[in-house]
Amino acid sequence: PEPPTACREKQYLINSQCCSLCQPGQKLVSDCTEFTETECLPCGESEFLDTWNRETHCHQHKYCDPNLGLRVQQKGTSETDTICTCEEGWHCTSEACESCVLHRSCSPGFGVKQIATGVSDTICEPCPVGFFSNVSSAFEKCHPWTSCETKDLVVQQAGTNKTDVVCGPQDRLRA
């Protein structure tokens, strides 16, 4: 028969014949022959291959370097890489999470719209009218101004985006 020019899925063409690819978690040792199938062997400890492949070397699992603020979120297997995340209070600098930076704090006048995670930074938003933040924080949202009316008080000093209103007693002399 004519030698193949293309092979099925999970196969590859070598020496005019179709050989099976190695399954995830295994590496290629020897191509198939007319007598034997492809020879594959398992990846070693701390190695992985995540696709059907003809790689002769497995990839090393990612190292979550604590000196860079990293820790293991999910341990790697022979078929998956280790997933790193950042220590509490830090977040990844990129999608690959190769290093971490401290979560940003929202300055006075700004509140936290979205609290940071291991992979995303704090998102701040300016406090709108009626709200304020008087601290620099990575957790605090903008707080609503105090409602003097509900306390039977009146506004003595208007609030800003950084300060709360100041309430005071009603003027008794007023009819």
Epitope: I14, N15, L28, V29, S30, D31, T33, F35, T36, E37, E39, L41, P42, G44, E45, T56, H57
Partner: antibody, heavy 115, light 110 residues
Amino acid sequence: QVQLVQSGAEVKKPGSSVKVSCKASGGTFSSYAVSWVRQAPGQGLEWMGMINPSGGTTSYAQKFQGRVTMTRDTSTSTVYMELSSLRPEDTAVYYCARGFRMDQWGQGTLVTVSS
Amino acid sequence: QSALTQPPSASGSPGQSVTISCTGTSSDVGAYNFVSWYQQHPGNAPKLIIYDVRKRPRGIPDRFSASKSGNTASLTVSGLQADDEADYYCSSYAGNNNLVFGGGTKLTVL
């Protein structure tokens, strides 16, 4: 069909080194690992190590670590096994074979270590 | 790694079946489905007759079969023929790019 052809018999003095070659023909040289196995007279098979011709990476059996070196020459499709600090107990037939599975074997090379 | 354990000898009459065992550990035979068997006639290089526990290379007769249970692999030669008289070796992948052989079994056809 892969064929492995080894170099000829050697007689060596204790303390010296021997380098055995294994030339591959047929198939793609870089697409299979090569194991080395030895067999002392009247004894069983002993795996010595392997070399991956595509990257030249090696793995040696603990027993031979520090005494064996496996190399390859992709231009001539040849792999080499060098054993140093030879002793009389190293007298054996040395085989190269394809892969860990060892589905094709060389004809063997007799190495005699004698003073 | 220490060698896998095989009986030094086995025998059978023509037409009979004989089984050779190969015992390893949970780090080699028990851990991987990468057990091979070789036949070696005197003065010749070994020949692969079984790989990946139970697969036969093309051209090897189905009189040769093999299996594995736990840390022990077995080779069965059925319908014994005079030419089956030879030494038989098992091998197993042992992890970390290492391989270990059995000590060999001399099969005699009576």
